[in-house]
């Protein structure tokens, strides 16, 4: 019996300033029960980039349709990229609980930002 895997297929993504960055993430199972969240950086100082249930993330949209059944695609798009967005982004599966606990993280995708073409 195989445990859920979090797959971030792109080790790195390069995006021109002002463009949108798509960060890919898929999982291999619908269990354990619990949410997916996106972070920039690792460790206790990591920055929450997207949490579907709580918070306001105006620059982030989900790639999969909101009505897609049995969704295993948790890719996101971040709009209007600036140099301040550079860093490594992690797709993280949580196990439902009180509170939710981190179950497994993807390997990360490094986002680099190119100068805006003149």
């Amino acid at each position: 019996e195989e445990e859920l895997q979090v797959i971030q297929p792109d080790k790195s993504v390069s995006v021109a300033a002002g463009e949108s960055a798509i960060l890919h993430c898929t999982v291999t199972s619908l269990i354990p029960v619990g949410p997916i969240q996106w972070f920039r950086g690792a460790g206790p100082a990591r920055e929450l980039i997207y949490n579907q249930k709580e918070g306001h993330f105006p620059r982030v949209t989900t790639v999969s349709e909101s009505t897609k059944r049995e969704n295993m695609d948790f890719s996101i798009s971040i709009s209007n990229i600036t140099p301040a967005d550079a860093g490594t982004y992690y797709c993280v599966k949580f196990r439902k609980g009180s509170p939710d606990t981190e179950f497994k993280s993807g390997a990360g995708t490094e986002l680099s930002v190119r100068a805006k073409p003149s």
Epitope: L30, I31, P32, V33, S64, E65, T67, K68, E70, N71
Partner: antibody, heavy 120, light 108 residues
Framework: EVQLVESGGGVVQPGGSLRLSCAAS????????VSWVRQAPGKGLEWVST??????YYADSVKGRFTISRDNSKNTLYLQMNSLRAEDTAVYYC???????????????WGQGTLVTVSS | EIVLTQSPATLSVSPGERVTLSCRAS??????IAWYQQKPGQAPRLLIY???SRDTGIPARFSGSGSGTDFTLTISSLQSEDFGVYYC??????????FGGGTKVEIK
């Protein structure tokens, strides 16, 4: 075609035990959460328990008395019910959990149910 | 625990009439609401999920709407086979999953 078939119901005395089974087919059982929902005679639906992988969740009314488990090699869900009370009398349904988008869970397929009667 | 209140408790309707069932949540559940139909002696059947998405094979006369705390299931033209009890369920915040008390739709 998704099928869920419950078994193991019956009459049991208060304080007794019973083990329900739910045989699943027609979907990749091992990657889905599955649940038990019950319905007392003439009453509404009450969620009992859900199991993901090894993560389990219970209604307060059954916590400490009921244990949900699964055997993915047999595509079977179980509910071990101990210290049964008269108020546990109900039809017990096995249900497949479904998700939508980044949310979940609701129940998209249900078995026909098995009746548990707790009476002396 | 999120409490779901359904109204009315019972509805007597003639075939062909439009039916509107209400489900009110005690707190915001966004669109994380499902609707089920249950006929006597049968298991519940999923009709609507995500407040307004019809499950596969559900006739177009069934529609769901609402978000936040107020939700509606509408049957545009009731058929004789639509009798039964209708339940809403929230899956925004669990455990526990909670169901409404149900609305019984009787055929006049």
């Amino acid at each position: 075609e998704v099928q869920l078939v419950e078994s193991g119901g019956g009459v049991v005395q208060p304080g007794g035990s019973l083990r329900l089974s739910c045989a699943a087919s027609g979907f990749s059982f091992s990657i889905y959460a599955v649940s038990w929902v019950r319905q007392a005679p003439g009453k509404g639906l009450e969620w009992v328990s859900t199991i993901g992988a090894d993560d389990t969740y219970y209604a307060d009314s059954v916590k400490g008395r009921f244990t949900i488990s699964r055997d993915n090699s047999k595509n079977t869900l179980y509910l071990q019910m101990n210290s049964l009370r008269a108020e546990d009398t109900a039809v017990y349904y096995c249900a497949k959990d479904s998700t939508v988008g980044w949310s979940g869970d609701f129940f998209d397929y249900w078995g026909q149910g098995t009746l548990v009667t707790v009476s002396s | 625990e999120i409490v779901l209140t359904q109204s009315p408790a019972t509805l007597s309707v003639s075939p062909g009439e439009r039916v509107t069932l209400s489900c009110r949540a005690s707190q915001n559940v966004r669109s994380d609401i499902a609707w089920y139909q249950q006929k006597p002696g049968q298991a519940p059947r999923l009709l609507i999920y995500a407040a307004s998405s019809r499950d596969t094979g559900i006739p177009a006369r069934f529609s769901g709407s609402g978000s936040g705390t107020d939700f509606t299931l509408t049957i545009s033209s009731l058929q004789s086979e639509d009798f039964g009890v209708y339940y809403c369920q929230q899956y925004y915040d669990w455990p526990p999953f909670t169901f409404g008390g149900g609305t019984k739709v009787e055929i006049k």
